[in-house]
Interface confidence: medium
Amino acid sequence: ECVTQLLKDTCFEGGDITTVFTPSAKYCQVVCTYHPRCLLFTFTAESPSEDPTRWFTCVLKDSVTETLPRVNRTAAISGYSFKQCSHQISACNKDIYVDLDMKGINYNSSVAKSAQECQERCTDDVHCHFFTYATRQFPSLEHRNICLLKHTQTGTPTRITKLDKVVSGFSLKSCALSNLACIRDIFPNTVFADSNIDSVMAPDAFVCGRICTHHPGCLFFTFFSQEWPKESQRNLCLLKTSESGLPSTRIKKSKALSGFSLQSCRHSIPVFCHSSFYHDTDFLGEELDIVAAKSHEACQKLCTNAVRCQFFTYTPAQASCNEGKGKCYLKLSSNGSPTKILHGRGGISGYTLRLCKMDNECTTKIKPRIVGGTASVRGEWPWQVTLHTTSPTQRHLCGGSIIGNQWILTAAHCFYGVESPKILRVYSGILNQSEIKEDTSFFGVQEIIIHDQYKMAESGYDIALLKLETTVNYTDSQRPICLPSKGDRNVIYTDCWVTGWGYRKLRDKIQNTLQKAKIPLVTNEECQKRYRGHKITHKMICAGYREGGKDACKGDSGGPLSCKHNEVWHLVGITSWGEGCAQRERPGVYTNVVEYVDWILEKTQAV
């Protein structure tokens, strides 16, 4: 059961796994949630009645019964992990802790104008987990305005002490705010020869890469496949680091694969959600339970519903035994990964899906799309919304995209002549405009945020945010799309679609059914040749066929140019402008979303 509130002056007795230091009980709860085994925790706040060496300790605990005896203790704050909850969880922590010194390895010291600059430096440094900044009121003159970047093996401080006139905080890499470059490629037949900081067992290089991404010290990895010549190293995932943050050497070796931590673009990739099944593969680990199940899918459900289960192996039923039910072995380990992986025994293995909620909701796989045709089907583009105006009469105004549970991203030019957000209605989960009746539920708009450099669509900055009055509950028919990552400049998108209820030709009317068209991206250089009278800037992106025929048109404005990469959909563009519709050698021009990620995050994450 999900318990979110913290229990003041309460200590859980026993069940200790490990002790870490955190600046607050709230952050202790996050650490517990991300730990593979932690279900409960006890945090000790600063208090005159408590030994200062125990201040800020966060004791992570586990229990077979999912609870522990409670004892009264002043300054103790206890609670439960969010693993038991169904809501979205984020490791992003923007809090600044005043008069606290978070101890770690101080590997970089420099002068900074402010704590914010120090935090930015930490976010853009590959090794940095947290920082301490000495303010200009700090007693020691030579240490004033000094920004100390720190790291530890666990990503959390080794100790926290009170220290006047300093502030501390964490890297904002997990808030999608890092400028570090993302290298998404997995390199076949390659071994990176640098220090190993840890090793785990993984069924494939993709799982190995995800484990590296959420491991605090891992910067890149090498994975030995099941065909690797040395048997004892098969399925071994080596988590690695180096001083420069990059591999010093690439060695060509068959049956090995290597790649990078995607820490700085983790908001747009699944990190915790290993949803694949591994056939003819057995995962070994501590056995939690053995239950009968009809299929490997049913076994995965059982594992997901058992809070302590981390992975499973399903052995299909032998002929007519046990009403056709096989055995479902629910398992766990100290680090969440199998202790050994065996092949050729006929088992089907996989992981719990309980941790999927720790990934950004936008990374969830959506239903397979219908190939061919121009009309969409329900749930095909769950981030697409229709924005209506009610003045003078109600009508479809523009498209938009859900990017957060209270945020729609659209085009600034949609709001020409819109005096107030009160006349706007956002409808989500809609396929046909005819579904919208008087009593159809909608989201009111609390605020329209237009980019302050916007003048007209053709000169750029054609981007706006709508803050909704109420939050969107995510379902299969309404869920967010991922923003592209700032560090992801090497991605070449080849599977891009424009969607909307707009005109099918220049003189037409709004369509009833949501239309879709697959459209190739065009280089800005090529686009500029087609629009000699305009300036195509890097803040714009173009898409279209040379021969025309498929394009966005009037009424599609503000809607998404959605591109799929590695099974995840990204909002690459916002429909902005073009010469006519679907004309030969006149591509559509879209707002290049990656160039506005900072602006979007600044507006949507403002406290």
Partner: nanobody, 122 residues
């Protein structure tokens, strides 16, 4: 200390090419990455391309993809930026930078060249 010296800038017509060089000297084995940044008149610094010196990983910003190529000659401790199909908006002072991080953030680079001006006229 690391010293960086850029060369190869100049004036060129739109559609033309230039090749910038950045020669590094001094304590160069401390450099994990080298980058080209540019600053157009009245604008901030913009990352153009990155290269990881030991392993050769490369990254480009969207606006130069397919037109610019970064490369290195380890024997000469030199990094190059081959710029083809130049456009008026490529006009800027181009800086070579070296540091330990493979990053688009200028703050991640400890060593900078003096800059070389590239002017593209349409």
């Amino acid at each position: 200390q690391v010293q960086l010296v850029e060369s190869g800038g100049g004036s060129v017509q739109a559609g033309g090419s230039l090749r910038l060089s950045c020669a590094a000297s001094g304590y160069t084995y401390s450099m994990g990455a080298m980058a080209w940044f540019r600053q157009a008149p009245g604008k901030g610094l913009e990352g153009v391309s990155l290269i990881a010196t030991s392993s050769g990983f490369i990254s480009y910003t969207d606006s130069v993809k397919g037109r610019f190529t970064i490369s290195q000659d380890n024997s000469k401790n030199t990094v190059y930026l081959q710029m083809n199909s130049l456009r008026a908006e490529d006009t800027a002072v181009y800086y070579c930078a070296a540091g330990t991080q493979f990053s688009w953030s200028p703050g991640s680079y400890n060593y900078w060249g003096q800059g070389t001006l590239v002017t593209v006229s349409s």
